[in-house]
Interface confidence: medium
């Protein structure tokens, strides 16, 4: 055909017919097979979706191409011709590679290779697992610490290279007839205290624990100083009742004769139960309290000095006789409506609650536990309505600058305790910034509308008295008659009413 | 609903004595220290003393010491005040009351009255 | 003993008026101070705790104030059914001591 008789506008991949006229070449396509229309394009058929027939056979995959098409094996597989096309079904001779074979240190150390249809797995060895990160590599199981539990309880799981052992553990002997090694390997405890191997000071107990023994104070003795108690080196001193004698410079009978009564009760501490002790301290308190006679007549300030003394004696001596209290829970409660609440738990990972008639303690059991003292934790809360006649017209000492709460508006102005006063202790003594919070929930007396409610902490003076303060402690929310606060530190708290309305809050303390 | 319903209106002997019950209900017995006050006619309220139910522990105003006895009965909630040697001066009524939040007294009961006569 | 002085037996006021009862203790009872409403027949019912402290039920117009040993019971617009006898009582020590009384009657 001459070239002045083809189109020149003819698209790519097409060719002309005549000076008016294009055909799309094969494998393409166009609205219709002789076009005249300069616009018109030619689009790739594509072969290997319907209506087109093409087949290219099992373990295979058919892939388009511009114009045309190609038949491949799957990964895995390869034609027996080692030619990487074929055009049909029956040029298909794909069969499934060997990569084993192929590839010998296909899978690394402690791996078995294993050929499967199309691809290859590795296999490892008993007592060997694939590493996460690379499934080929496999790597030693530790038995001891894959959660199989391969070895009885009564014995320590010893991890080898691809396997592992059972073995007694220090303190243990395999059982008659069994052997100390293999995995059915079961021992039993060596009683150091019964058979005397132990190494226990006169001053303490043995006690055999699973495995092994410690040396635990006698009741009512203590660990000499420095000493940890609960060890096999544990040496301890008989304990003596906490002193707690009255504040110096106040002169109050009253408060004399709570004293007088409260070093009765140390004199005969050793023949009485802690419990008891325990028992009698609190109705002296609560009957003090009821009664306070003539602490009314102290000035303000002596009557802060004294209910500080009464409540870090309280802390300081029932932290004492705590320690001789056996594990369990203890409440009781006074007619003048002193509280006191304690539980005495091993080790345990869990919250405790300590519930009272106008107030609820939460926090974790690891607070109470005293570092390196693997003996029993206490928590303790103590209840003192009473208190509140000793504390009253005390100052709040606001946070950022440690300023007497005072303005121009609300001069002389002071909070109104709204709560029972309580103190919290714990085995513990350390607790003045804790790793957990502690979540008190106080009822009270009514808040007075748009007053604002604070949670506070009594916090003991330069000069041994004392006063409110908020630092550490948020009030969480508040209700009414009840109120929740937050606490990263343990003391005396309670809840006071603002002497202000919110809408004209004091700033340093918002 | 918090009640005290007191024992009804008693008429004595003078030297006799006599035994007044506050029967309790609505709030938990052993939670709460009950009071009792006299009033005599035309005068004012007097404290005579507590009972703690929960360990029977008492108090007294002194100057009722070895006139008024407290008791009570936890498995019926009663408490119950007896009045010895009774003279014409004890003619009174006489209440009991709960304990409220602190040492008021929250709740009072019906009050019994006592007459002594001859 | 901490004794506690009302100073008026009675005290006559007209309807709608404001009422003024004082109590005064014997030894600074810091605030610990409870008011109650005696009506005729019926036993006392507690009307003020803390010196300050309205109980529920009692309208508004009641209010109490004071400290150290002297305290105010007062009542604003004076209503018939006001009509009782007020008492204060001292928690601050035992033994528990109330007032004498102070009889509220309408003029």
């Known amino acids: 055909q001459d070239s002045r008789d083809c189109a020149r506008w003819c698209p790519e991949n097409s060719s002309c017919v005549n000076a008016t006229a294009c055909r799309c070449n094969p494998g393409f396509s166009s609205s219709s097979e002789i076009f005249t229309s300069p616009t018109e394009i030619c689009d790739d058929i594509n072969e290997c979706v319907p209506p087109s027939k093409v087949s290219c056979g099992k373990s295979s995959d058919c892939r388009n191409t511009e114009g045309s098409y190609d038949c491949v094996c799957n990964p895995g597989y390869e034609l027996v011709s080692g030619a990487k096309t074929f055009k049909n079904e029956s040029e298909n001779t794909c069969q499934d590679v060997d990569e084993c074979q192929q590839n010998p240190r296909l899978c690394k150390s402690y791996g078995t290779c294993v050929n499967t249809l199309g691809s290859f797995t590795c296999q490892c060895l008993p007592g060997f697992k694939f590493k996460p990160e690379d499934p080929k590599l496999c790597t030693d199981v530790n038995e001891c610490t894959s959660g199989q539990n391969p070895c009885h309880s009564s014995t320590h799981c010893l991890n080898n290279v691809g396997s592992y052992q059972c073995r007694c553990r220090p303190g243990w002997q395999p059982i008659p007839g069994s052997p100390n090694g293999p995995n059915n390997t079961v021992c039993e405890d060596v009683d150091e205290c019964s058979s005397g191997l132990h190494q226990c000071d006169s001053s303490t107990i043995c006690f055999n624990t699973v495995g092994l023994y410690t040396c635990r104070c006698r009741p009512g003795w203590e660990p000499k100083h420095g000493i940890p108690n609960n060890q096999k080196d544990t040496v301890c001193k008989d304990m003596h009742f906490p002193t707690w004698t009255p504040p110096p410079g106040v002169h109050s009978q009253t408060l004399s004769q709570f004293f007088n009564k409260v070093q009765d009760l140390g004199r005969d501490f050793k023949t009485r139960s802690a419990k008891v002790t325990i028992q009698s301290i609190l109705k002296e308190l609560d009957e003090l309290l009821e009664a306070p006679g003539d602490l009314e007549t102290l000035p303000r300030f002596q009557q802060h000095c004294v209910a500080t003394h009464l409540l870090d004696g309280l802390e300081d001596v029932f932290r004492g006789l705590s320690k001789n209290l056996s594990i369990g829970l203890l409440n009781f409660s006074y007619p003048a409506g002193t509280e006191f609440s304690l539980e005495v738990q091993k080790q345990v990972d869990r919250n405790v609650t300590l519930r009272q008639n106008q107030a609820t303690m939460q926090l974790h059991w690891n607070l109470a536990q005293k570092s390196g003292d693997p003996g029993p934790s206490v928590v303790g809360l103590v209840s003192v309505p009473g208190m509140g006649k000793l504390l009253a017209e005390v100052p709040l000492v606001s946070e950022p600058e440690n300023q007497v709460v005072r303005n121009e508006t609300h001069q002389g102005l002071l909070p109104i305790l709204l709560s029972d006063i309580i103190s919290a202790f714990l085995s513990n003594n350390d607790t003045q910034n804790l790793s957990s919070p502690v979540t008190f929930t106080f009822s009270h007396r009514s808040v007075i509308p748009r007053q604002k409610v604070l949670c506070v902490f009594w916090e003991h003076g330069q000069n041994g008295c004392g006063h409110w303060a908020t630092t550490g402690c948020s009030t969480m929310g508040t209700r009414d008659t009840s109120t929740i606060c937050r606490c990263t530190h343990l003391s005396s708290f309670a809840v006071l009413m603002a002497p202000y309305d919110v809408q004209e809050e004091d700033p340093v303390l918002t | 609903q918090v009640q005290l319903q007191q024992s009804d209106a008693e008429l004595v002997k003078p030297g006799a004595s006599v035994k007044i019950s506050c029967k309790v209900s609505?709030?938990?017995?052993?939670?709460?220290?009950i009071h009792w006050m006299r009033q005599r006619p035309e005068q004012g309220l007097e404290w005579i003393g507590y009972?703690?139910?929960?360990?029977?522990?008492?108090r007294y105003n002194e100057k009722f010491k070895g006139k008024a006895s407290l008791t009570a009965d936890k498995s019926s909630t009663t408490a119950y005040m007896q009045l010895s040697s009774l003279t014409s001066e004890d003619s009174a009524v006489y209440f009991c009351?709960?304990?409220?939040?602190?040492?008021?007294?929250?709740?009072w009961g019906t009050g019994t009255t006592v007459t002594v006569s001859s | 003993d901490i004794q506690m002085t009302q100073a008026s037996s009675y005290l006559s006021v007209s309807l709608g008026g404001r009422v003024t009862i004082t109590c005064k203790a014997s030894?600074?009872?810091?605030?610990?101070l409870a008011w109650y409403q005696q009506k005729p027949g019926n036993a006392p019912r507690l009307l003020i705790s803390?010196?300050?402290n309205l109980e529920t039920g009692f309208p508004s117009r009641f209010s109490g104030s004071g400290s150290g040993k002297d305290y105010t019971l007062s009542i604003t617009s004076l209503q018939t059914e006001d009509v009782a006898t007020y008492y204060c009582q001292q928690y601050w020590n035992i033994p528990y001591t109330f007032g004498g009384g102070t009889k509220l009657e309408i003029e």
């Open positions: 030894d600074h009872i810091n605030n610990w």
């Open positions: 803390h010196a300050t």
């Open positions: 009972i703690y139910p929960t360990d029977g522990n008492t």
């Open positions: 609505g709030f938990s017995f052993t939670d709460h220290t």
């Open positions: 009351a709960k304990r409220g939040y602190y040492w008021y007294f929250d709740v």
